[in-house]
């Protein structure tokens, strides 16, 4: 058993059949020493009487806040939480698998530059009762802050009969060195209880490998005189790190047919222009990635051709 | 070419040289998904590899101070990456075909450093981490891990020599 | 995009030879190793050797060493396997194959196949 | 050489049925192990490198798996268009050597 915060207690447990559980003895915290009684969540049966209370947990029905009295008088809680492993493996039931990049990816997180700023996000389909807490450092051994605010409910969505809930978080390192080559990952740890269920789960990753640009912004074309040729230009998003002679990305410029099976025609760039050919009813895409780190590409910013 | 005294190197050369080290470090380990190299053990492995720091000068701001701190830091992990790419962890099982990034890489690692430090100037170089992995498991992950490590170093690399192409060339 | 297209079948007499050409298009012929591997009928495949064309260096399988020459042609982009001192147990499918960009063997692209019979 | 002995040399599965096909190498190959399938008439395809890195394109119901020296592929859900003959490969250590093969059908 271990103390999540004041007053909740995780009770980690083997979870199978007619396995033994674990016994807890809980004290009052008070100064009194007779006369004191405990009760279980709202229910007013007597489970024991002293100062402490020993209890065998083995389900969740053992589970729920524990709460001493004297007298009619409440003396002070225990909010007793359960995680279960079941063969050797902790559970996972809260959240969602994403499965990108891998199996087993609970959370996932991104970064728009090399500021130390980033957002990592997960799925569930459990709509109440359901509390997060999210913290960060830089290492583990020796940890270098990381601030995180609240989790909060930043999308629904209704996939086949069930709803899916998307919460993120925002961190933001506390001493980022954006040109310095990481060399100590950031570790993200998210402490989720659903009712009496308590589980947790961590990602590992460095900055560099979450880069995800904004699209490029302004999106122009100016027809070349006497030519099917368009010169295609745009600007670093506003949100990328700078000088950018220092931080620079590389561009794909695609053309793209109205139909999906139309051949696509791709230019690779790192000048912030291209020329290329705009086809009727096509549409001309640009795509950033950082230039020196295979990262993710940004999402297309696109305009059409007409 | 930077000399310890602290004349400029060849900014433009060495951009080009370091974005094409990129490249070939990317080629020879596409992969970032096929097996999470922090997870498996041998931590001692690659902690020892040379990284740019916090203090090492290789920002912005840095650089128009006195790029000097920075080229020799760069010089050092060349020259570190070089030794590593040509030792036995790439050159025993599992086997690498001739055509393999990592000849060239190798070739292009040593071809840069000498960009930075000409014949006749020594810079202090680090210790390489006598490793002679005995299995192909231990040596594929080693390799795997290097490679990583180098694309994350030739990145911050080929930033400074863009950088200094773009606002420190005379 | 890469292609690799073999010469087509051939029937020979034992102890005679056959050459396999494969032209390579769609990337730098100089670039990559191109393989041989063989596929006797209902059987699995063996893998015979390769040439590296931008230093015309053959490595040969041990067991097909003295049977096998193989050569490449950077002004046709073409590689060529030569199988001498045929016998019935040399018959089978033949193929060229290049590998994964990175430098180890897994191979991504590959010829349609040659057949060679010996017979006699 | 290094051997690579695969079995089963042949089965027989219903569609839907999850199918599992083993290669054990006579040596450590670390994970360099790639499976192939080959339907008949045609050439071989890539499907699994690194023993568990899916090619481009090829459907999610391929999974590979195991590393040193032994190594597993499983087709989670067969299909109808699975039917063929599947191949281990060792790219580890000099001559390349490969599975006899399984040559899988449906029941």
């Known amino acids: 058993i271990w103390e999540l915060k004041k007053d909740v207690y995780v009770v980690e447990l083997d979870w199978y059949p007619d396995a033994p559980g674990e016994m807890v003895v809980l004290t009052c915290d008070t100064p009194e020493e007779d006369g004191i009684t405990w009760t279980l969540d709202q229910s007013s049966e007597v489970l024991g009487s002293g100062k402490t209370l020993t209890i065998q947990v083995k389900e969740f029905g053992d589970a729920g806040q524990y709460t001493c009295h004297k007298g009619g008088e409440v003396l002070s809680h225990s909010l007793l939480l359960l995680h279960k492993k079941e063969d050797g493996i902790w559970s996972t039931d809260i959240l969602k698998d994403q499965k990108e990049p891998k199996n087993k990816t609970f959370l996932r997180c991104e970064a728009k530059n090399y500021s130390g700023r980033f957002t990592c996000w997960w799925l569930t389909t459990i709509s109440t009762d359901l509390t997060f807490s999210v913290k960060s450092s830089r290492g583990s051994s020796d940890p270098q802050g990381v601030t995180c605010g609240a989790a909060t409910l930043s999308a629904e969505r209704v996939r086949g009969d069930n709803k899916e809930y998307e919460y993120s978080v925002e961190c933001q390192e506390d001493s980022a060195c954006p040109a310095a080559e990481e060399s100590l990952p950031i570790e993200v740890m998210v402490d989720a209880v659903h009712k009496l269920k308590y589980e947790n789960y961590t990602s590992s990753f460095f900055i560099r490998d979450i880069i995800k640009p904004d699209p490029p912004k302004n999106l122009q074309l100016k027809p070349l005189k006497n030519s099917r040729q368009v010169e295609v230009s745009w600007e670093y998003p506003d949100t990328w790190s700078t000088p950018h002679s220092y931080f620079s990305l590389t561009f794909c410029v695609q053309v793209q047919g109205k139909s999906k099976r139309e051949k696509k025609d791709r230019v690779f760039t790192d000048k912030t222009s291209a020329t290329v050919i705009c086809r009727k009813n096509a549409s001309i895409s640009v795509r950033a990635q950082d230039r020196y780190y295979s990262s993710s590409w940004s999402e297309w910013a696109s305009v059409p051709c007409s | 070419r930077a000399v310890p005294g602290g004349s400029s190197p060849a900014w433009t050369q060495c951009q080009q040289l370091s974005q094409k080290l990129c490249t070939l470090a990317w080629s020879a380990h596409p992969l970032v998904g096929h097996m999470d190299l922090r997870e498996e053990g041998d931590e001692e492995t690659t902690n020892d590899v040379p990284h740019i720091q916090c203090g090492d000068g290789c920002d912005p701001q840095g650089l128009r101070d006195n790029s000097q701190f920075c080229l020799q830091r760069i010089h050092q992990g060349l020259i570190f990456y070089e030794k590593l790419l040509g030792s036995d962890i790439f050159t025993g099982e599992p086997s690498l075909l001739p055509d393999s990034p990592v000849g060239q890489l190798h070739a292009s690692l040593l071809g840069l450093s000498q960009l930075l430090q000409p014949e006749g100037h020594h810079w202090e170089t680090q210790q390489i981490p006598s490793l002679s992995p005995s299995q192909p498991w231990q040596r594929l992950l080693l390799r795997f891990k290097i490679l990583r490590s180098l694309q994350a170093f030739v990145a911050v690399a080929a930033r400074v020599f863009a950088h200094g192409a773009a606002t420190l060339s005379p | 995009q890469v292609q690799l297209v073999q010469s087509g079948a051939e029937v020979k007499k034992p102890g005679s030879s056959v050459k396999v050409s494969c032209k390579a298009s769609g990337y730098t012929f100089t670039d990559q190793t191109i393989h041989w591997m063989r596929q006797a009928p209902g059987q699995g495949l063996e893998w015979i050797g390769y040439?590296?064309?931008?230093?015309?260096?053959?490595k040969y399988n041990e067991n097909f060493k003295g049977k096998v020459t193989i050569t490449a042609d950077d002004s046709t982009s073409t590689a060529y396997m030569e199988l001498s001192s045929l016998r019935s147990e040399d018959t089978a499918v033949y193929y060229c194959a290049i590998p994964d960009r990175s430098g180890y063997a897994w191979f991504i692209y590959w010829g349609q196949g040659t057949l060679v019979t010996v017979s006699s | 050489d290094i051997q690579m002995t695969q079995s089963p040399s042949s089965l027989s599965a219903s569609v839907g049925d999850r199918v599992t096909i083993t290669c054990k190498a006579s040596r450590d190959v670390a994970i360099a192990v790639a499976w192939y399938q080959q339907k008949p008439g045609k050439v071989p395809k890539l499907l699994i490198y690194w023993a568990s890195t899916r090619h481009t394109g090829v459907p999610s119901r391929f999974s590979g798996s195991g590393s040193r020296t032994d190594f597993t592929l499983t087709i989670s859900s067969l299909q109808p268009e699975d039917v063929a003959d599947y191949f281990c490969?060792?790219?580890?250590?000099?001559?390349?050597?490969f599975g006899s093969g399984t040559k899988l059908e449906i029941k």
């Open positions: 040439i590296y064309p931008r230093d015309d260096s053959p």
């Open positions: 490969h060792q790219y580890s250590s000099y001559p390349f050597t």
